[in-house]
């Protein structure tokens, strides 16, 4: 596949994953769809670190847009040279995107491992932290959290989604990093008539 077409495909995938991360992070702020917990000290630190919004979202949106532009035609100088200019920009933004996706993965992984902050036996805290992630395999005790309601499945689902999305983002940003580097040195494989006059 041409580096340009590959960049466009990767870029669109990254933008989609960005939106998934941003939506997932937004939903983490409203456990069980209830806004009453958002302004209180009852959400876990990993939710407030905004891994999905900042890392997997905004920081990956840049390489996503850059990759789509690098796969486009014209705009930055004429022909081959202009494309190489955009490919170079995509190299740097992809590296930036990898950092963002790693941040999202780290925060979401910690969120999954520690479990949510919840009220259990009259005490607020990270009650699942003790289990080092083993609670994920034993659902019988998820119900011991009294509030926010159904916070454990809510957090597990959304943090799992963020982990999966950020892993894909790391792979895609890595692919685009290699693809854009090839594009910088070798140019695009498109024929002359494809380029604007």
């Amino acid at each position: 596949m041409c580096t340009g077409k590959c960049a466009r495909c990767v870029g669109l995938s990254l933008i989609t994953l960005c939106l998934v991360c941003i939506v997932a992070n937004a939903l983490l702020l409203v456990p069980n769809g209830e806004t009453s917990w958002t302004n209180t000290n009852h959400l876990s630190l990993q939710v407030w670190l905004m891994g999905g919004f900042i890392g997997g979202g905004l920081m990956v949106l840049c390489p996503g847009i850059a990759a789509v532009r690098a796969g486009g035609k014209g705009c930055c100088g004429a022909g081959c040279c202009g494309n190489r200019c955009r490919m170079l920009r995509s190299v740097f933004s992809s590296a930036f995107g990898v950092l963002g996706a790693i941040y999202c993965l780290s925060v979401s992984g910690a969120g999954l491992r520690n479990g949510p902050r919840c009220l259990m036996n009259g005490e607020w805290g990270y009650h699942f932290e003790d289990t080092a992630g083993a609670y994920l395999l034993n659902r019988t005790l998820w119900d011991r959290c009294e509030a926010p309601p159904r916070v454990v499945p809510w957090n597990v689902t959304l943090f799992s989604l963020l982990v999966a999305a950020s892993c894909l983002e790391i792979v895609l940003c890595g692919i685009q990093l290699v693809n854009a580097t090839i594009g910088v040195f070798c140019g695009d494989c498109r024929k002359k008539q494809d380029t604007p006059h």
């Epitope: 259990m120 036996n121 003790d130 083993a134 009294e146 509030a147 309601p149």
Partner: antibody, heavy 120, light 112 residues
Framework: QVQLEQSGGDLVKPGGSLKLSCAAS????????MSWVRQTPDKRLEWVAT????????YYPDSVKGRFTISRDNAKNTLYLQMRSLKSEDTAMYYC?????????????WGQGTTLTVSS | DIVMTQSPLSLPVSLGDQASISCRSS???????????LEWYLQKPGQSPKLLIY???NRFSGVPDRFSGSGSGTDFTLKISRVEAEDLGVYYC?????????FGSGTKLEIK
């Protein structure tokens, strides 16, 4: 098989202190919440303390809060109950019990019990 | 604190008969998750208590099917369909829904 071996029961004067131990074997101790339950001379059962699997969370009824401390050493597979400022009403048979899971749930296994007598 | 009241305090039965023990809580022990953490324990003479029933009606492993639990809200019942000699002892109900966790005063099952 699951075994909970208790020790440390004694005759203590009011205001005194005592530490009970419960040595666990036959299961992964660090994966289970543990509790102490006592049985008074009139055969009533009373929950005394609970500790989560990693020791991060502890719970007590008001009757013992501030006087009793539950702790655990997961490396030694041992549960402890440190009792201070003992009163005559603390006289009881003390049982350690395992919870099904890392925190408060049903008591699925119990120790054989150890007797504390608080008397002058 | 939630007070668990058991009745009767003593229950004389003939072997093979059905026995029924009642446990009433001073307030609802329905947990906010929708579960009711009510358990039944049997303490035989000279032994530690043993779990029979958890979450109102679930039999613990190894417990014979002649034991059954039922109820909701504040009223709970343990039924033994055909009493056997090994069932004799003191039965305790326990609520683990709200701290402080509390036991019932016990019901002594004995031969008539």
């Amino acid at each position: 098989q699951v075994q909970l071996e208790q020790s440390g029961g004694d005759l203590v004067k009011p205001g005194g202190s005592l530490k009970l131990s419960c040595a666990a074997s036959g299961f992964t101790f660090s994966s289970y919440g543990m509790s102490w339950v006592r049985q008074t001379p009139d055969k009533r059962l009373e929950w005394v303390a609970t500790i989560s699997s990693g020791g991060g969370y502890t719970y007590y009824p008001d009757s013992v809060k501030g006087r009793f401390t539950i702790s655990r050493d997961n490396a030694k597979n041992t549960l402890y109950l440190q009792m201070r400022s003992l009163k005559s009403e603390d006289t009881a048979m003390y049982y350690c019990a395992r919870h099904e899971g890392f925190t408060t749930y049903y008591f699925d296994y119990w120790g054989q019990g150890t007797t504390l007598t608080v008397s002058s | 604190d939630i007070v668990m009241t058991q009745s009767p305090l003593s229950l004389p039965v003939s072997l093979g008969d059905q026995a029924s023990i009642s446990c009433r809580s001073s307030q609802s022990i329905l947990h906010s998750s929708g579960n009711t953490y009510l358990e039944w324990y049997l303490q035989k003479p000279g032994q530690s208590p043993k779990l029979l029933i958890y979450k109102v009606s679930n039999r613990f492993s190894g417990v014979p099917d002649r034991f059954s639990g039922s109820g909701s809200g504040t009223d709970f019942t343990l039924k033994i369909s055909r009493v056997e000699a090994e069932d004799l002892g003191v039965y305790y109900c326990f609520q683990g829904s709200h701290v402080p966790f509390t036991f019932g005063s016990g019901t002594k099952l004995e031969i008539k």
